[in-house]
């Protein structure tokens, strides 16, 4: 089976305050089985932004139907962006288990927030 790659094609994304930000993430294999999670920041203090298996995440929606078994697009849209949302976002594949364990991370996408156009 093909080795899983996690592709975050955009190194950076710039969005005006109040708009929505789309953060792209695709995977190249359905294996290993397990959820995709999005985090802001790296290391122990990273913050969970989206998890397929829990929620709700009121400002986060998936761009495609992640519930479909063959889905490989785990891009998300974050609505009503504010300057406090700036940071680096990571798309991470977990291997199913008790608990799920981190398998592989995307390279990250840095979100910057522009002032609201007047």
């Amino acid at each position: 089976e093909e080795e899983l790659q996690i592709i975050q094609p955009d190194k950076s994304v710039s969005v005006a305050a109040g708009e929505s930000a789309i953060l792209h993430c695709t995977i190249t294999s359905l294996f290993p089985v397990g959820p995709i999670q999005w985090f802001r920041g790296a290391g122990p203090a990273r913050v969970l932004i989206y998890n397929q298996r829990q929620g709700p995440f009121p400002r986060v929606t998936t761009v495609s139907e992640t519930t479909k078994r063959e889905n490989m697009d785990f891009s998300i849209s974050i609505s009503n962006i504010t300057p406090a949302d700036a940071g680096t976002y990571y798309c991470i594949k977990f291997r199913k288990g008790s608990p799920d364990t981190e398998f592989k991370s995307g390279a990250g996408t840095e979100l910057s927030v522009r002032a609201k156009p007047s």
Partner: antibody, heavy 117, light 108 residues
């Protein structure tokens, strides 16, 4: 409003155990790392332990092997199990919410642990 | 482990005056330095992170500067509520997260 409320402190003898709790509200507990920081009487702040959103745990060398941090996401509660307590563990223990920047933006009022014979 | 040294230990200042105190790291922390304020009997309060970014709700009279190993917290005009102990903390990505020993700002 974010609120963190510690409980479980008290007076114990050296070698005994104690379990601290921290009840969190006002934020999505499951999404954030949380931490314990302590302050001995008249002294400065000392980081004790942290648990990440995925449950990975980290400890200061001074408590490694004696203290265990855990979280119950269904109850939005953080715990610190303290075993083999020593006089030098006497302190006010604070729990705090951790931002993705690794800083502690909200703190509880603390609970006092006194270890004395 | 990164050791943070704060100076002076105590600073005596009159209300309305400017207060400046420092934090020195034993090795570079880039801009990953935070400042907290603690009043007697209270929990610490986050003031500054990333060396110079004010936390939510912190007045503009508080400002941070520095990078690498040398950092400064300045209170431009001390108010009565600013008399407290101030701690620095390095917030690089991985534990242990260390604090300085504190600077007590007292009324002159």
């Amino acid at each position: 409003d974010v609120q963190l409320v510690e409980s479980g402190g008290g007076l114990v003898r050296p070698g005994e155990s104690l379990r601290l709790s921290c009840a969190a509200s006002g934020f999505t507990f499951t999404n954030y790392a949380v931490t314990w920081v302590r302050q001995a009487p008249g002294e400065g702040l000392e980081w004790v332990s942290l648990i990440s959103v995925t449950g990975t745990t980290y400890y200061a060398d001074s408590v490694k092997g004696r203290f265990t941090i855990s979280r119950d996401n269904s109850k939005s509660t953080l715990y610190l199990q303290m075993n083999s307590l020593r006089a030098e563990d006497t302190a006010v223990y604070y729990c705090a919410k951790v931002t993705w920047k690794n800083v502690f933006d909200y703190w509880g009022l603390g609970t006092l642990v006194t270890v004395s014979s | 482990e990164i050791v943070l040294t704060q100076s002076p230990g105590t600073l005596s200042v009159s209300p309305g005056e400017r207060a400046t105190f420092s934090c020195r790291a034993s090795q570079t922390v880039g801009s990953k330095l935070a400042w907290y304020q603690q009043k007697p009997g209270q929990a610490p309060r986050l003031l500054i992170y990333d060396a110079n970014t004010r936390a939510t709700g912190i007045p503009a009279r508080f400002s941070g500067s520095g990078s690498g190993t040398e950092f400064t917290l300045t209170i431009s005009s001390l108010q009565s509520e600013d008399f407290a102990v101030y701690y620095c903390q390095q917030h690089t990505d991985w534990p242990p997260y260390t604090f300085g020993g504190g600077t007590k700002v007292e009324i002159k």
